[in-house]
């Protein structure tokens, strides 16, 4: 079965800067990736970025730069200040829509013990079957 992994990293240089990396471990063709925070998209979460493999990117503050890393993984840099700034216990979720598997979503946050500059290993987070 497909899996989604989520990795959250706080940058050592800026404590309000986070990098989220997400990947899809499956054989299908990805049609859309949605990154959200505060919970799964559509379940109280707020969309940070939407990435289409051909048509491009839409992103929303405090997202600074979303991009495809490979055909099956993306990264998103967040830079916030004040109310729009992520904090250490913020949950980030990535939802991959793929054919023929459907939609798969996983969430992750910064590990409690992480020092700035460290990150969680990119292991699959609990998988939520969306569709």
């Amino acid at each position: 079965t497909p899996e989604v992994w989520v990795q959250v990293r706080m940058e050592a240089t800026e404590l309000s800067s986070f990098t989220i990396r997400c990947g899809f471990l499956g054989s299908g063709s990805i049609s859309l990736v949605t990154v959200s925070w505060g919970g799964p998209n559509g379940a109280g979460g707020t969309t940070l970025a939407v990435l289409h493999p051909e048509r491009g990117i839409r992103q929303w503050a405090p997202a600074r730069q979303a991009r495809w890393e490979t055909q099956s993984s993306i990264s998103l840099i967040l830079e916030g200040s004040g109310a729009s700034s992520p904090c250490a216990n913020t949950t980030f979720c990535c939802k991959f829509a793929s054919f023929p598997e459907g939609s798969w979503e996983a969430c992750g946050s910064l590990p409690p013990s992480s020092d700035p500059g460290l990150s969680a290993p990119p292991t699959p987070a609990p998988i939520l079957r969306a569709d």
Partner: antibody, heavy 119, light 107 residues
Framework: EVQLQQSGPELVKPGSSVKISCEAS????????VDWVKQSHGKSLEWIGA????????SYNQKFEGKATLTVDKSSTTAYMELRSLTSEDSAVYYC????????????WGTGTTVTVSS | DIVMTQSQKFMSTSVGDRVSITCKAS??????VDWYQQKPGQSPKTLIH???NRHTGVPDRFTGSGSGTDFTLTISNIQSEDLADYFC?????????FGGGTKLEVK
């Protein structure tokens, strides 16, 4: 008919601010994002930023952060862009445009607002 | 930032002719390119989205092609009303960027 009607021309002094509007009609405002584009005289187009009417979420071209502030009023189906600390470099025509989320493009453009900064 | 280069600033053509306007991206932007037409004193109008999809109501004389870094807008059977500036736009990455424009003159 789908329309984006923008406010009229503005003649403003250097250092001041201006707020221009983009009133949407003929469609469900919340179903589309509104982006803003600058066209300096005789020049090409520059993307300023976007706003999502549903939650007021914004995205800016870094070049315009601190210069432009995007807001919406859902009740009047109107998007606004405020430009601050104006200089002659800000003299331009500003357009709003409707972004189609499912198809990923601007399908309708506003009428344009000319801003002239002069003492 | 991704640079969109329209190397032809001006193009001259005659009614009934066919012309190709090109746009080159500084990096691979897949098919995330649109084409817009702007007639003198008017707002831009959408012609082509996602490199090759014609916008509703746009005559089939307008055709978009290309992917990756090289894109072309072809106008066949040129009409006098096609006198305009033509711009490409990439929305593959932030910030979105436009080409410098190509002004089409119809003799």
């Amino acid at each position: 008919e789908v329309q984006l009607q923008q406010s009229g021309p503005e003649l403003v002094k250097p250092g001041s601010s201006v707020k221009i509007s983009c009133e949407a009609s003929g469609f469900t405002f919340a179903d589309y994002n509104v982006d803003w584009v600058k066209q300096s005289h005789g020049k090409s187009l520059e993307w300023i930023g976007a706003i999502n009417p549903n939650d007021g979420g914004t995205s800016y071209n870094q070049k315009f952060e601190g210069k432009a502030t995007l807001t919406v009023d859902k009740s009047s189906t109107t998007a606004y862009m405020e430009l601050r600390s104006l200089t002659s470099e800000d003299s331009a025509v500003y357009y709003c445009a409707r972004w189609v989320n499912n198809d990923w493009y601007f399908d309708v453009w506003g009428t344009g607002t000319t801003v002239t900064v002069s003492s | 930032d991704i640079v969109m280069t329209q190397s032809q600033k001006f193009m001259s053509t005659s009614v009934g002719d066919r012309v190709s306007i090109t746009c080159k991206a500084s990096q691979n932007v897949r098919s995330a390119v649109d084409w817009y037409q702007q007639k003198p004193g008017q707002s831009p109008k959408t012609l082509i989205h996602s490199a090759s999809n014609r916008h509703t109501g746009v005559p089939d004389r307008f055709t978009g092609s290309g992917s990756g870094t090289d894109f072309t807008l072809t106008i066949s059977n040129i009409q006098s009303e096609d006198l305009a500036d033509y711009f490409c736009l990439q929305h593959w990455n932030y910030p979105y960027t436009f080409g410098g424009g190509t002004k089409l003159e119809v003799k």
